[in-house]
């Protein structure tokens, strides 16, 4: 074990927070300011990331690790670790390359990010539309149009049957 | 690699409006700051102002009443606008890519010389 | 002006090291990395330093930079005559949200 321990890399034994420098005989040194390492064995220590401008720091960089952003406000993250802040549009709205522009008729988006979407077609599930959609909302779908008719309830029995010709009162 | 590109006038008369346009090429105007310094002749630089991709923007107060800063994504372009002109905005002005990890001015335009002149 | 404070020369004779050196407050050098730029007569000014420490891919060893609360300093060793140029401290200022420079220092190499 002792044999086995001796061939290892020395810089295996140093920890999270610190690296393994080669210009002090491969002794763990710490991470300087501005710098982490996450993992043990490291020979050099990752820069840490700055939160200005749009960004926002949410943690702190610490020897072991990395800042982490978020956005300022009127600005939502996007990408892994919140890369990026794209723009907040108002709801009814979307992101173009052109700013924020509003839903176009037949869409809505009832958030602040994102893209428009269409509104539920309700006739494709049969159903007829209770509620409008607007930029902001979407339609809200309600029984189908045969369920409407005068009497047609889940409790009451079927209609007898009427002769052709007839119409409904 | 990325490289930028600055167009405008060489020559404002005083009272006027400096435009300036930072063209963007060999790379995506996404995810950086985008900032305008200028140097006046034999004197410091001097931060004017920056504008992140999705259009946040922050100006140096001195300058702040005076300028505006765009950016059209679709065009990969950013712009300078400067108001007011005097003889003392005679200068260098340069474009320059701020990284948004370390904010480092890592790529410059190579300046264009601005006289403020009747 | 500058609200970073640089000396406006120095100089050295090849192969002498020198150092610049670069004082802030707080608000600047005190919370945040500073990055160095080079500039040559006529030319945009080049990033040599970024961090306090890092140099980007294609600059010397021979250059290097350090920060100790509110001051920064860069070091060329080795001095050639190629470095004579104009060098400048930045970093960004929490008062300001947005960079700050130094007036710069002019190398000069004896």
């Known amino acids: 074990f002792e044999r086995t321990r001796s061939l290892q890399d020395p810089c295996s034994n140093c920890p999270a927070g610190t690296f393994c420098d080669n210009n002090r005989n491969q002794i763990c040194s710490p991470c300087p300011p501005n710098s982490f390492s996450s993992a043990g064995g490291q020979r050099t220590c990752d820069i840490c990331r700055q939160c200005k401008g749009v960004f926002r720091t949410r943690k702190e960089c610490s020897s072991t690790s990395n800042a982490e952003c978020d956005c300022t406000p009127g600005f939502h993250c996007l990408g892994a670790g919140c890369s990026m802040c794209e723009q907040d549009c108002k709801q009814g709205q979307e992101l173009t390359k052109k700013g924020c522009k509003d839903c176009c008729f037949g869409t809505f988006n009832d958030q602040k990010r994102g893209i428009c979407r269409p509104w539920t077609n309700c006739s494709l599930d049969g159903k007829s539309v209770l509620v409008n959609g607007t930029k902001e909302r979407d339609v809200v779908c309600g029984p189908s149009p045969a369920d409407l008719s005068p009497g047609a309830s889940s409790v009451t029995p079927p209609a007898p049957a009427r002769e052709p010709g007839h119409s409904p009162q | 690699q990325v490289q930028l590109q600055e167009s405008g006038p060489g020559l404002v008369k005083p009272s006027e409006t400096l435009s300036l346009t930072c063209t963007v090429s060999?790379?995506?105007?996404?995810?950086?700051?985008w900032s305008w310094i200028r140097q006046p002749p034999g004197k410091c630089l001097e931060w004017i102002g920056y504008?992140?991709?999705?259009?946040?923007?922050n100006y140096n107060p001195s300058l702040k009443s005076r300028v505006n800063i765009s950016v059209d994504t679709s065009q990969n372009q950013f712009s300078l606008k400067l108001n007011s002109l005097t003889a003392a905005d005679t200068a260098v002005y340069y474009c320059?890519?701020?990284?948004?990890?370390?904010?480092?001015?890592?790529?410059w335009g190579q300046g264009t010389t601005v006289t403020v002149s009747s | 002006q500058s609200v970073l404070t640089q000396p406006p020369s120095a100089s050295g004779t090849p192969g002498q090291r020198v150092t610049i050196s670069c004082s802030g407050s707080?608000?600047?050098?005190?919370?945040?990395?500073v990055n160095w730029y080079q500039q040559f007569p006529g030319t945009a000014p080049k990033l040599l330093i970024y961090?306090?420490?890092q140099r980007p891919s294609g600059v010397p060893d021979r250059f290097s930079g350090s920060k100790s609360g509110t001051s920064a300093s860069l070091a060329i060793s080795g001095l050639q005559s190629e470095d004579e140029a104009d060098y400048y401290c930045?970093?960004?200022?929490?008062?300001?949200?947005?960079?700050?420079f130094g007036c710069g220092t002019k190398l000069t190499v004896l």
């Open positions: 320059a890519r701020t990284h948004s990890y370390y904010y480092g001015m890592d790529v």
């Open positions: 060999g790379g995506s105007i996404s995810s950086y700051y």
């Open positions: 504008i992140y991709y999705s259009g946040y923007t």
């Open positions: 707080s608000s600047n050098i005190g919370n945040n990395p």
């Open positions: 961090s306090n420490n």
């Open positions: 930045e970093a960004w200022d929490d008062s300001l949200n947005g960079p700050v």
